[in-house]
């Protein structure tokens, strides 16, 4: 075979968002008959030669970026996409509210606001049961980006987290759930209650207003300051896609 072997997948089960003291398993999956796996924690000089890592109780020090590769004969594969293992519950939960309220008419607008008592500059908003809410942004989003009308498919349960860009893998506990109800329509949203929570968006500003724009499941932000979308590495290829949106300088 010419060229490197195809990359394996790396996933965290049951989720890459892990409450402190809860268990998680990291699993690297390559093709059948792999000779050797290598799992590593980036920026730590830590490795193992096995495909599976069981963490019996999540700790702050175990959060971070992981990746894996495999060897067949003398050939090494391309590395997997990075998996970002996040410890949650490190800080007190933020509060999540809806403006003007959690009940919105179909075709109306709604703003979700996540607030924290800490000076955090990052927020993550999740919709329960949404396995892959993100698509890649098609443009740079700025404060003037229009708020798109709400449809029935966006009814559901939302939670947010807050964290600092200085420690991007140590997150707060989740906010209390916010039930968003879209009225004036009989369409029932599709929900997968057995799925782990999936990311909807991550936002800048210590008290950021999160304007949820419902177009093709792409959630964007609007605040009083200009926001620049800056996608980083995606999450586990086997899990939901996740993009980061951080305030531009």
């Amino acid at each position: 075979q010419s060229g490197p072997l195809p990359k394996p997948s790396l996933q965290a089960l049951p989720s890459s968002l892990v409450p402190l003291e809860k268990p998680v398993t990291l699993r690297c999956q390559g093709p059948p008959g792999v000779d050797l796996y290598r799992l590593e924690k980036l920026s730590s000089s830590r490795y193992q030669d096995q495909a599976v890592l069981f963490i019996p109780a999540m700790k702050r020090s175990l959060a971070g970026r992981y990746r894996c590769s495999y060897q067949n004969g003398s050939l090494w594969s391309l590395p997997s996409d990075q998996l970002e293992l996040v410890a949650t519950g490190v800080f007190a939960k933020p509060s999540l509210s809806a403006q003007p309220g959690p009940a919105v008419s179909s075709g109306g607008d709604v703003t979700l606001q996540c607030q924290t008592r800490y000076g955090f500059d990052q927020f993550a908003l999740y919709k329960e049961g949404d396995p892959a809410p993100y698509k890649n942004p098609e443009r740079w989003y700025r404060a003037s980006f229009p708020i798109i009308t709400v449809t029935a498919a966006h009814s559901g349960t939302y939670r947010c987290y807050s964290f600092s860009s200085r420690d991007p893998y140590l997150w707060s506990a989740p906010s209390d759930p916010l039930e968003l109800v879209v009225t004036g329509t009989s369409v029932t949203p599709s929900r997968l209650p057995t799925e782990p929570p999936s990311p909807v968006a991550e936002f800048s500003e210590a008290t950021a207003e999160l304007t949820v724009s419902f177009t093709n499941e792409v959630f964007t932000t609007e605040t009083s300051r200009s926001i620049t979308a800056s996608p980083k590495e995606s999450d586990s290829p086997a899990g939901p896609a996740r993009q980061y949106y951080t305030k531009g300088n």
């Epitope: 590593e40 730590s44 000089s45 830590r46 193992q48 096995q50 890592l53 069981f54 999540m58």
Partner: nanobody, 127 residues
Framework: QVQLQESGGGLVQPGGSLRLSCAAS????????MGWFHQAPGKEREFLAG????????YYADSVRGRFTISRDNAKNTVSLQMNSLNPEDTAVYYC????????????????????WGRGTQVTVSS
């Protein structure tokens, strides 16, 4: 901290085998990643092999993978290094070390992560 004592070193011919053992005392042994390092004359101390707290996961330096095997017995508080196909470049002082990381940590190749060290055992590979 864990107290560590290596044994099993000696003189061996090229192509031969040796089994090193490390006896540990201290309550934290079963919660520590254990590693073997060696230091050849005039060189830096170098990671060879490590094993997780449970023994389920291991990691080897490329120079010894396939020739050396690390294992541990938590009931006896020992960690061993089986060394096969030895060559003169393996001549060094071999050290056992403990890294008190949380269960679920990967194996560190960095000396500074290990806070307990034995005094070492000499291995000489020569004909």
């Amino acid at each position: 901290q864990v107290q560590l004592q290596e044994s099993g070193g000696g003189l061996v011919q090229p192509g031969g085998s040796l089994r090193l053992s490390c006896a540990a005392s201290g309550r934290t042994f079963t919660r520590s990643i254990m590693g073997w390092f060696h230091q050849a004359p005039g060189k830096e101390r170098e990671f060879l092999a490590g094993i997780s707290w449970s023994g389920a996961n291991t990691y080897y330096a490329d120079s010894v993978r396939g020739r050396f095997t690390i294992s541990r017995d938590n009931a006896k508080n020992t960690v061993s290094l089986q060394m096969n196909s030895l060559n003169p470049e393996d001549t060094a002082v071999y050290y056992c070390a403990a890294d008190p990381s949380h269960p679920g940590s990967l194996i560190s190749t960095r000396r500074s992560d290990y806070d307990s060290w034995g005094r070492g055992t000499q291995v000489t590979v020569s004909s």
